[in-house]
Structures are given as structure tokens and as C-alpha cells.
Interface confidence: medium
């Protein structure tokens, strides 16, 4: 077993705006890490890089550095906020997002993250993939866990 | 002043589990880490395995995984460690310990041990 | 699994003697951080076993200081400068900073 281990638990909530005159989407998306560390000796998350890709797109980028210290045997849970935009040649979708008729908006987000754990003189990169549901028209909060997009394509833990 | 106080004697029959208790005092429970120690007659101390009480993470002797399970209960500020499939060769004295996070103090304080007895 | 070699298995003295015990990893037990989490015990028949030393060289509180530690590294040394009766017992030294945690072999301090 890995000494540091990576979690990726789910989106925790996604708000929503619009610009109607660019058919533009933001989605502010806030994910769950679970980090735990089995070691005897406290570890460094030095930095979490994370982007979220939509149909093979990267729409939105972001980097949190000097996280936290994770004591020896412990586990610290970690919320990181990616703001994504939805445009240009896909604002198709902005038509999608905010159509009345329908309740739920799913679209499928492929989350990426990054965590870099400085320890013993080395740092350790472990990164994570998820697919997961959020609903790009209307401001949601989820159960954790909830927003899981189970697909063949989902990367094994 | 700090102490680590044991359940008492065990005679358990082979192929059961016990559950050997270890409650603290005298110190924040969730600031150290408790040990588990075990000493068999005309051998020496053999490490088991340790839990972070705050956390509840452990982690075990590859020899001891899937024999002994440790486990603890902040409220009542006690460690707990199951043995289980019990047979002969798990008779001995078991001991809790405990271990400080941040300075290189290993089990400073232990417990007076636990006498564990298999037999038919 | 770090392996911790301890010698003697037997060390048989007279009161007033002045003993080493060896132990010796097979790797180092410096972290990152520079400690050391190398500990010695006394274990006597019926009692719990006691803390001696811890990273290397620091004496337990109440621990008398005919009992020192040395080392580094590697390789480790307890040292007791003047043997009481008291002090009979097994001792071993345990290395905390690698998973698992391991304990040498003992060595039986006994009178000759």
C-alpha cells in the first residue's frame, strides 16, 4: 500500500452562472480529497492541481499551494474550488443548461487532480481521474458520492 | 498521572477471538498514538501494530494482518485490539503503549499486560 | 522489513561491572526531519517493559543516568557504566522510524 493515499471523493457543490449574451456558462465547481497519511511522520501537501475537462475539453484550471500538514496516521478531508466556463464552440450547451423544461441538467465532467506530498526529502505526485454528474443549470450541493458518473470509461481506485 | 490500564486474564477456547481493552488516562487520548506489543514465554517482543486514536488509522505487523484488529473509542478514551481464530500460538502476554506524534518518544507508558491463555 | 540485530543474546556480569549492548539496523533510522526514533527497554519477568532511552541518546524521565545511549545511523549502543541488581532483566531496543515497527532480538543481562 501506497504510504500517502489519494481519495477522490466527489463534487461537494456546483454554482452556476450565465452570460446570455456570450451563451456562456461558469460553473464553480468544489471537489472532496480524502488524503491519508501512514506513515509515522508528518507529510507536507505541498500543492493540488486539479482541471476539468468537458467532451475532451479542458475548461477550467486550478492550483492551491502550502496546503496543510498531515500528522503521522491521520487523514485530513481537503475542498478545492475549479472555475470552469462553458463557451465558444461549445455553447450549444448554454441551450441545454438553462432549457425550463426539463428538472435536472447532467452534463459529464471528467475531474483530474494532482497532489504533490513533500516527505523524506522527496516529493511524491499522485494523481486521480473521476467522471462525475453536475448540473450546469442551477446551483446544486451534493451528497458525497452522489455525483458519480459510473461509465466504463470510470478509471478503477 | 498518565496510565494505560488493562482488561483482565483470558482463557479462550482455540479457533474464538478475544477483545483485549487498554483505557487511558492521565493525558489526551487523541494525542498519541497507542502501540501493541506482544511476549510470548522464551521469545522476545514482537511489535503488532499501531492506532492513531484521533484518526482511528492503522497500521500492522504484515505478520499480525487478519489476526488482530485495532480499534478505539475516544469517548471512553480506550484502545481496543481482537484476536481472532484463536490457537496456541497466540498465547502470551499482550501490552498497550503509548507513542508521542511529534518527538521521537516510542511507548513511554505501557500497560500492565494482558494474559492471554488458549486452550481446549 | 527493517531488520534490528542485537548483541549480545547474553551478557553475563557482576554487579559494579560497566556493559555494552549493540544494535544495529539494516538500514538507517535518520528520517527526513533528522530523528531518530531508536529506543531502548528493560523488560523484567512480570512487569511491563520500561523505557530507558528514546532517539538515541535521551534518558527517560527517571531513568538514572549510569544508563547512556550512542549512534547514529545504523548502529547503536546502550550503555550501563555501573551494573545494580536492579538492572537485570532483558533489554531490547526497538526502531520506530520505518513501517512496521521492530524490536531486536534481547539481550539477558544476568548475574555470573
Known amino acids: 500500500p501506497r504510504s500517502i493515499d489519494v481519495k477522490y471523493i466527489g463534487v461537494k457543490s456546483a454554482y452556476v452562472s450565465y452570460d446570455v449574451q456570450k451563451r456562456t456558462i461558469y460553473l464553480n465547481i468544489t471537489n472532496t480529497l480524502n488524503i491519508t497519511n501512514n506513515n509515522y511522520y508528518s507529510v507536507e501537501v505541498e500543492n493540488i492541481t486539479a482541471q476539468v475537462q468537458f467532451s475532451k475539453t479542458v475548461i477550467g484550471k486550478a492550483r492551491l499551494n502550502n496546503i496543510t500538514i498531515i500528522g503521522p496516521l491521520d487523514m485530513k478531508q481537503i475542498d478545492y474550488t475549479v472555475p470552469t466556463v462553458i463557451a465558444e464552440e461549445m455553447s450549444y450547451m448554454y441551450d441545454f443548461c438553462t432549457l425550463i423544461s426539463i428538472k435536472v441538467h447532467n452534463i459529464v465532467l471528467m475531474m483530474q487532480v494532482t497532489v504533490t506530498t513533500t516527505y523524506f526529502g522527496h516529493s511524491e505526485q499522485i494523481s486521480q481521474e473521476r467522471y462525475q454528474y453536475v448540473d450546469c443549470g442551477r446551483n446544486t450541493t451534493y451528497q458525497l458520492g452522489q455525483s458519480e458518473y459510473l461509465n466504463v470509461l470510470q478509471p478503477q481506485q | 498521572q498518565v496510565q494505560l490500564q488493562q482488561s483482565g486474564a483470558e482463557l479462550i477456547r482455540p479457533g474464538t477471538s478475544v477483545k483485549v481493552s487498554c483505557k487511558a488516562s492521565g493525558y489526551a487520548f487523541t494525542n498519541y498514538l497507542i502501540e501493541w506489543v506482544k511476549k510470548r514465554p522464551g521469545q522476545g517482543l514482537e511489535w503488532i501494530g499501531v492506532i492513531n486514536p484521533g484518526s482511528g488509522i492503522t497500521n500492522y505487523n504484515e505478520k499480525f494482518k487478519g489476526k488482530a484488529t485495532l480499534t478505539a473509542d475516544k469517548s471512553s478514551s480506550t484502545a481496543y485490539m481482537q484476536l481472532s481464530s484463536l490457537t496456541s500460538e497466540d498465547s502470551a502476554v499482550y501490552f498497550c503503549?503509548?507513542?508521542?506524534?511529534?518527538?521521537?518518544?516510542?511507548?513511554?507508558?505501557w500497560g500492565q499486560g494482558t494474559t492471554v491463555t488458549v486452550s481446549s | 522489513d527493517i531488520v534490528v540485530t542485537q548483541t549480545p543474546l547474553s551478557l553475563p556480569v557482576s554487579f559494579g561491572d560497566q556493559v555494552s549492548i549493540s544494535c544495529r539496523s539494516s538500514q538507517s533510522l535518520t528520517n527526513y526531519y533528522g530523528n531518530t526514533y531508536l529506543s531502548w527497554y528493560l523488560h523484567k519477568p512480570g512487569q511491563s517493559p520500561q523505557l530507558l532511552i528514546y532517539g538515541i541518546s535521551n534518558r527517560f524521565s527517571g531513568v538514572p543516568d549510569r544508563f547512556s545511549g550512542s549512534g547514529s545511523g545504523t548502529d547503536f549502543t546502550l550503555k550501563i557504566s555501573t551494573i545494580k541488581p536492579e538492572d537485570l532483566g532483558m533489554y531490547y531496543c526497538?526502531?520506530?522510524?520505518?513501517?512496521?515497527?521492530?524490536f531486536g532480538g534481547g539481550t539477558k543481562l544476568e548475574i555470573k
Open positions: 526497538l526502531q520506530g522510524t520505518h513501517q512496521p515497527r521492530t
Open positions: 503503549a503509548r507513542s508521542d506524534f511529534i518527538t521521537t518518544v516510542v511507548a513511554d507508558y
